[in-house]
Interface confidence: medium
């Protein structure tokens, strides 16, 4: 692939893991023991985009799947989706903006802000087993902080 990626898993600040829920949706729930194998492994690609000291543009694909998290307008609302792409062309250095997230690191916690929709973040609900979504509020009830765990290639 044109851009080398980092394999990782993500957990929200309440330690909920992310798993597939149907073919095009992720949900967040607490996993233990062997169930941890269900969690999604992301392929994080470092792409070109606006960057500052603590804001790094990345794309989040699902490892060994031709699916990427993307941000689009649905019914006039910024929405998170899993989008299918041509694996021959992805990942690439210059990803379309809908695929790009600004990875923001604060005290070893990560936020993922949509590059397409500033101040909208990958979010999870406090409740168990709910979809991962794009949220427009930080510091409220919804969770926007994540930790990353390396996964060997």
């Amino acid at each position: 692939a044109p851009v080398r990626s980092l394999n990782c898993t993500l957990r929200d600040s309440q330690q909920k893991s992310l798993v597939m829920s149907g073919p095009y949706e992720l949900k967040a729930l607490h996993l233990q023991g062997q169930d941890m194998e269900q969690q999604v492994v992301f392929s994080m690609s470092f792409v070109q985009g606006e960057e500052s000291n603590d804001k790094i543009p990345v794309a989040l694909g699902l490892k060994e799947k031709n699916l990427y998290l993307s941000c689009v307008l649905k019914d006039d609302k910024p929405t998170l989706q899993l989008e299918s792409v041509d694996p021959k062309n992805y990942p690439k250095k210059k990803m379309e903006k809908r695929f790009v997230f600004n990875k923001i690191e604060i005290n070893n916690k990560l936020e993922f802000e949509s590059a397409q929709f500033p101040n909208w973040y990958i979010s999870t609900s406090q409740a168990e087993n709910m979809p991962v979504f794009l949220g427009g509020t930080k510091g409220g009830q919804d969770i926007t902080d994540f930790t990353m765990q390396f996964v060997s290639s």
Epitope: Q48, K93, F150
Partner: antibody, heavy 123, light 106 residues
Framework: QLQLQESGPGLVKPSETLSLTCTVS??????????WGWIRQPPGKGLEWMGN???????HYNPSLKSRVTISVDTSKNQFSLKLSSVTAADTAVFYC????????????????WGQGTTVTVS | SYELTQPPSVSVSPGQTASITCSGD??????VCWYQQKPGQSPVLVIF???RRPSGIPERFSGSNSGNTATLTISGTQAMDEADYYC?????????FGGGTKLTVL
């Protein structure tokens, strides 16, 4: 402002082990998105990457040196270290420690902070 | 093993444009960084991710990368730009440096 400082003996005997330490100041070695590397430069020659380490302790080494190089990290002292075994005169060089950004060098962010370098002579 | 090839030396007159090349197999598929090293000093990152400048690096430094060749361009070269320049890329968990190019400002 994050700074790096190499330290260690300037003279090592052939067949012995070269040991250097890099002390990180002005920032934490435990910041998860950084990696830490060692690079050397023989007199009058170019840069040669030796290896990287991550705060978690995982390492990548130059295949040509892999059997002789060990890099370790001590988060409590905010330091990382290099050991190069079975040295010969060909290992005489200036040794630099450096900080890389964004977990892996393939991210393209490069090594943005370097120490001033320390000269090690094998004789 | 992967190799990056640079010309050993490049000369330029003050105020002119200097171009330093770095070639490697399908290099355009990788990110390239460039470092400047003046005599007796540590390397300094001048370009990352092919074409981006760290803060504090003058605008006269620019980079490009496509096909098998990455290029560092210094426009309006100044005497202070005289230094060794190294390209750097990454291959299979390994950091690769080019052999370096000595830029002489005549």
């Amino acid at each position: 402002q994050l700074q790096l400082q190499e330290s260690g003996p300037g003279l090592v005997k052939p067949s012995e082990t070269l040991s250097l330490t890099c002390t990180v100041s002005g920032g934490s070695i435990s910041r998860s998105s950084y990696y830490w590397g060692w690079i050397r430069q023989p007199p009058g020659k170019g840069l040669e990457w030796m290896g990287n380490i991550y705060y978690s302790g995982s390492t990548h080494y130059n295949p040509s040196l892999k059997s002789r190089v060990t890099i370790s990290v001590d988060t409590s002292k905010n330091q990382f270290s290099l050991k190069l075994s079975s040295v010969t005169a060909a290992d005489t060089a200036v040794f630099y420690c450096a900080k890389g950004r964004e977990y892996i060098s393939s991210s393209g962010y490069g090594m943005d902070v370097w120490g001033q370098g320390t000269t090690v002579t094998v004789s | 093993s992967y190799e990056l090839t640079q010309p050993p030396s490049v000369s330029v007159s003050p105020g002119q444009t200097a171009s330093i090349t770095c070639s490697g197999d399908k290099l355009g598929n990788k990110y390239v960084c460039w470092y400047q090293q003046k005599p007796g000093q540590s390397p300094v990152l001048v370009i990352f991710q092919d074409s981006r400048r760290p803060s504090g690096i003058p605008e006269r430094f620019s980079g490009s990368n496509s096909g098998n060749t990455a290029t560092l361009t210094i426009s309006g070269t100044q005497a202070m730009d005289e230094a060794d320049y190294y390209c750097q890329a990454w291959d299979t968990s390994t950091v690769i440096f080019g052999g370096g190019t000595k830029l002489t400002v005549l």
